[in-house]
């Protein structure tokens, strides 16, 4: 009986037309929501004038429906048993699941000022930037609506720059009408243990952002894993949001709508400094901000963001070193709310529930030549927002899953 079930599972998890896996893979049957909490800065003047700690107050959730679009340009390659695709991006605001509207205002770090002063470190260039910042009446902080902050706004300072630059700024700009990929993944036809594992991303097996093994594209995209998952496994997956591959380890057995699933979590070790976890040495890309690679819990992804000083962390700097959160007041990290987990049905390897949590931060540094940054006495990794992207198998799908998969085995 077990062999027959195994055979059936192997057949149904292959990524090709006609299988259960393929149908749900092309267009997820799960409703996925992305909730945002914005860190509203309470004391912008004190920070700018006296280099005080930044006092933040999170406001949210502001919820969007995401991942509702079917994969595009799905192309099978029979020769190497892969399927390639684009994952289109789309976000629809959900007012009923939000605390306010997209027009709500927030005081946040001036993204353009922080980024430009980091990218252009030559003193003369900074003097030009300073005159444009002053001319545009820009400052270290700015007031922006949620819509502007997430999806883009025309920056008044960048609009004055006398050479070609992108003048539209936004944490997720551009998003709607764009796509992630091309991904090329193994379809599992020749070897089911490779199903959904990424072969190439954007035509390459490496990212070109990191040194050594850190640059590898490992595992799947976390939507599913090869079948027959064991608790002892370390599940590797690639996340384009954080520009790196990462891994999850088994934490506990969970019952999800009558389906036994394994909860895999991202361990604190994945965010550790190379001192504690030598494997992470290649995620430390500079020595000053990282205090000689002893800081932990923040990932400098500037190389992946055209040099903009973007740092990714867990929400509220969960699992981060004290020096990172020390200049920020108002953060309360806790595992339950702020860690990332995947609930995986072990027989099929399908992720039936997940919560992906991450925080977007921007580095701002003192600058002798930029007036609005002149009084800063230290570097700040400034939290801008954190997000919680969740998806749970629907009741109908869960019933179908119980009857067709777990029910048959039990």
């Amino acid at each position: 009986g077990d062999l027959l079930i195994q055979k059936t599972i192997k057949k149904q998890v292959v990524l090709e037309e006609g299988t259960i896996a393929f149908k749900n893979w092309v267009k997820t049957g799960t409703e996925v929501y992305r909730q945002f909490w914005i860190f509203d800065v309470q004391n912008p003047q004190e920070v700018m004038m006296n280099s005080s700690n930044i006092q933040v107050k999170q406001r949210g959730p502001y919820t969007y429906r995401v991942r509702f679009l079917a994969k595009e340009n799905v192309t099978q390659d029979a020769e190497d048993n892969t399927v390639s695709f684009l994952q289109p991006n789309g976000a629809i605001f959900e007012p009923s699941l939000s605390v306010g509207t997209e027009a709500d205002n927030f005081t946040v770090l001036n993204l353009a000022v922080a980024a430009a002063s980091h990218i252009y470190q030559n003193q003369f260039v900074q003097m030009i930037l300073n005159s444009l910042i002053n001319k545009s009446k820009s400052s270290m902080f700015q007031v922006r609506t949620l819509r502007e902050l997430l999806w883009g706004y025309r920056d008044p300072f960048l609009s004055l720059v006398p050479y070609p630059v992108t003048t539209t700024v936004g944490l997720f700009y551009p998003y709607n009408n764009t796509a992630d990929g091309v991904y090329k993944v193994f379809n599992g036809k020749d070897n089911i243990s490779k199903v959904a594992i990424i072969d190439t991303y954007k035509g390459k097996r490496n990212l070109s952002y990191w040194e050594s093994h850190c640059d590898m594209i490992n595992g799947t995209d976390a939507a599913s894993f090869p079948p027959f998952v064991e608790k002892s496994q370390v599940l590797q997956f690639f996340s384009s949001d954080i520009c790196r591959s990462i891994y999850a380890v088994f934490e506990s057995d969970v019952n999800l709508k009558g389906i036994p699933v394994y909860r895999f979590v991202l361990p604190s070790k994945a965010f550790a400094s190379p001192v504690e976890n030598p494997d992470n040495y290649c995620f430390c890309t500079e020595k000053i901000i990282s205090k000689n690679c002893t800081s932990y819990g923040v990932l400098d992804i500037s190389k992946c963001k055209e040099g903009r000083p973007v740092y990714i962390s867990l929400p509220h700097f969960l699992y981060a070193s004290p020096d990172v959160s020390e200049p920020i007041d108002g953060l309360n990290p806790n595992e339950e709310e702020h860690r990332t987990y995947l609930d995986i049905e072990p027989i099929t390897g399908f992720t039936l529930q997940f919560a992906k949590r991450l925080q977007v931060n921007l580095l701002v540094k003192p600058s002798e030549k930029i007036q609005v940054l002149k009084n800063l006495k230290r570097n700040y990794i400034v939290p801008i927002l954190w997000l919680n992207e969740t998806g749970t198998i629907g009741d109908e799908k869960a019933n179908m899953f119980r009857s067709q998969v777990t029910g048959k085995i039990n």
Epitope: N122, Q123, F124, V125, P162, Y163, P164, V165, E368
Partner: antibody
Framework: EVQLQQSGPELVKPGASVKISCKTS????????IHWVKQSHGKSLEWIGG????????SHKQNFKDKATLTVDKSSSTAYMELRSLTSEDSAVYYC??????????WGQGTTLTVSS | ETTVTQSPASLSMAIGEKVTIRCITS??????MNWYQQKPGEPPKLLIS???TLRPGVPSRFSSSGYGTDFVFTIENMLSEDVADYYC?????????FGSGTKLEIK
């Protein structure tokens, strides 16, 4: 060794234009800005403007805005300054200079421009 | 535009004497003052950069001090090779501006 090699002396007629070159070597051209400085005979130094080789962005002193055009050729690590509508007032020695974290740390040898009919 | 007033215009000193040149700026430029030496037929040479920093290879008899709007350049024991024109340059605001220069001669 960092070097800035300027083009030779120029004798031009009033109303004409002239283009002075500044060929750099011994460092990464795009990591520093290039500036131009005017020194009239027996007089002080006057900053004309500077250019960012990386993207061609520039800034000028107001009274040189319509007089001087600054350009670069990244492929040959060369900076250029074109001066137009020349008058006898433009007769001077023109220097190019490099600036990084320090103001004008290396200079070209200077180009003498004489405007005379 | 920040104007830079340099004094004196000329200076005649004996070998071994202490030389002092002063520059005053019309706006506060923190410590963004630079000092140059220029000998006849040569381009200016950077001696001291922002923050009163002596450039590598420059003899320690040269020094500077000052912050805000008032700056002083000093040669502790003048040598014959120090005969030259000296200029201050403010690099705190655009446009950069030079002082009018000081001609240093031997008495």
């Amino acid at each position: 060794e960092v070097q800035l090699q300027q083009s030779g002396p120029e004798l031009v007629k009033p109303g004409a234009s002239v283009k002075i070159s500044c060929k750099t070597s011994g460092y990464t051209f795009t990591e520093y800005t290039i500036h131009w400085v005017k020194q009239s005979h027996g007089k002080s130094l006057e900053w004309i403007g500077g250019i960012i080789p990386n993207n061609g962005g520039s800034s000028h002193k107001q009274n040189f805005k319509d007089k001087a055009t600054l350009t670069v050729d990244k492929s040959s690590s060369t900076a250029y300054m074109e001066l137009r509508s020349l008058t006898s007032e433009d007769s001077a020695v023109y220097y190019c200079a490099r600036a990084g974290d320090y103001a004008f740390d290396y200079w070209g040898q200077g180009t003498t421009l004489t405007v005379s009919s | 535009e920040t104007t830079v007033t340099q004094s004196p215009a000329s200076l005649s000193m004996a070998i071994g004497e202490k030389v002092t040149i002063r520059c005053i700026t019309s706006t506060d430029i923190d410590d963004d003052m630079n000092w140059y030496q220029q000998k006849p037929g040569e381009p200016p040479k950077l001696l001291i950069s922002e923050g009163n920093t002596l450039r590598p290879g420059v003899p320690s008899r040269f020094s500077s001090s000052g912050y805000g709007t008032d700056f002083v350049f000093t040669i502790e024991n003048m040598l014959s090779e120090d005969v030259a024109d000296y200029y201050c340059l403010q690099s705190g605001t655009l446009p950069f501006t030079f002082g009018s220069g000081t001609k240093l001669e031997i008495k």
